[in-house]
């Protein structure tokens, strides 16, 4: 959970389960300009392990739209454009926080949820085992 | 912002700025097992664009620990272990949601914040231009 420091200048909470439930301001402070990942760079096309981006939409979640990467090939693309199947294209995954409406369809009540998303792909050298 | 459906069975909110501020349950529902990214896979070591993971800690943020990827090389690692500088190792970035304590040090009041994190690296083929 979250380690809770105390401060007398803070908003008070009468919730008997505090600090299980907190107030969250939804006016997002954006530390960077938000962009559609397809526009932010063309790495997904120019990588040796290229990927396609799939739109995952869920109105009960915030953010409601998440882009999921799916590697285009099993292997990695060589300089000549052919695929090298002695190498592997694999998804790079990251655990992210989302807000899930709880109870469902409620506008002002959420629960934190961790989900695993594939952000892009990378080319790896597999460890080879020869089975006797 | 968040599109707000209405439902009579939802918790009520007396906040005059509603739905700017919502209640969030911090008992995280985890759709996957949470792991240190170093343990989840060794792609960071075996990729042709390997990366190091740096721990970014901030007690005023949830999650307080975020792992940032830094590409190990400018170029990409070839089969013989040497680096090919005609290719580029580049970070794959993703915008994620975090909770920022607001006011600072307060246990029960947060603001949503979007930050850009580097999750891993991929190897890309640059388009070459010769400058006249």
């Amino acid at each position: 959970g979250i380690a809770i420091p105390r401060n007398s200048g803070c908003p008070n909470s009468e919730d008997k389960n505090f600090p299980r439930t907190v107030m969250v301001n939804l006016n997002i402070h954006n530390r960077n300009t938000s962009t559609n990942p397809k526009r932010s760079s063309d790495y997904y096309n120019r990588s040796t392990s290229p990927w396609n981006l799939h739109r995952n939409e869920d109105p009960e979640r915030y953010p409601s739209v998440i882009w999921e990467a799916k590697c285009r090939h099993l292997g990695c693309v060589k300089a000549d454009g052919n695929v090298d199947y002695h190498m592997n294209s694999v998804p790079i995954q990251q655990e992210i926080l989302v807000l899930r409406r709880e109870p469902r369809h409620c506008p002002n009540s959420f629960r934190l949820e961790k989900i695993l998303v594939s952000v892009g792909c990378t080319c790896v050298t597999p460890i080879v085992h020869h089975v006797a | 912002g968040i599109a707000i459906p209405r439902n009579s069975g939802c918790p009520n909110s007396e906040d005059k700025n509603f739905p700017r501020t919502v209640m969030v349950n911090l008992n995280i529902h985890n759709r996957n097992t949470s792991t240190n990214p170093k343990r989840s896979s060794d792609y960071y070591n075996r990729s042709t664009s390997p990366w190091n993971l740096h721990r970014n800690e901030d007690p005023e943020r949830y999650p307080s620990v975020i792992w940032e990827a830094k590409c190990r090389h400018l170029g990409c690692v070839k089969a013989d272990g040497n680096v090919d500088y005609h290719m580029n190792s580049v970070p794959i970035q993703q915008e994620i949601l975090v909770l920022r304590r607001e006011p600072r040090h307060c246990p029960n009041s947060f603001r949503l914040e979007k930050i850009l994190v580097s999750v891993g690296c991929t190897c890309v083929t640059p388009i070459v231009h010769h400058v006249a």
Partner: nanobody
């Protein structure tokens, strides 16, 4: 359009020093890394040194490690290559490279000649 202006090449004796400079102008934003390659007749261009823009991480070819030092000036979009203890085998055309991750710009090159 991106422009690269290289300077500082010339002829020196073995053991001497030279400083190469490269200045980028035009739409040189979102720099990934900036650096130098070199080429001798009949051979492929080889990487010499590079500096990553985001964190000033530097990388060198084994052949120049400990002798060459790359540095940058963020404000001016310039990169310098200080070449010390030069050897005859450092003789080559040195090319400035500006890398924007998926697009790479090569300068016209500057000749460095090291005689014994």
């Amino acid at each position: 359009e991106v422009q690269l202006v290289e300077s500082g090449g010339g002829s020196v004796q073995a053991g001497d020093s030279l400083r190469l400079s490269c200045a980028a102008s035009g739409r040189a934003n979102s720099i990934n890394w900036f650096g130098w390659f070199r080429q001798t007749p009949g051979k492929e261009r080889e990487f010499v040194a590079g500096i990553r823009w985001s964190d000033a991480y530097t990388e060198y070819a084994n052949s120049v490690k400990g002798r060459f030092t790359i540095s940058r000036d963020n404000a001016k979009n310039t990169v310098d290559l200080q070449m010390d203890s030069l050897k005859p085998e450092d003789t080559a055309v040195y090319y400035c490279v500006l890398d924007l991750s998926t697009v790479r710009y090569w300068g016209q090159g500057t000749q460095v000649t090291v005689s014994s």
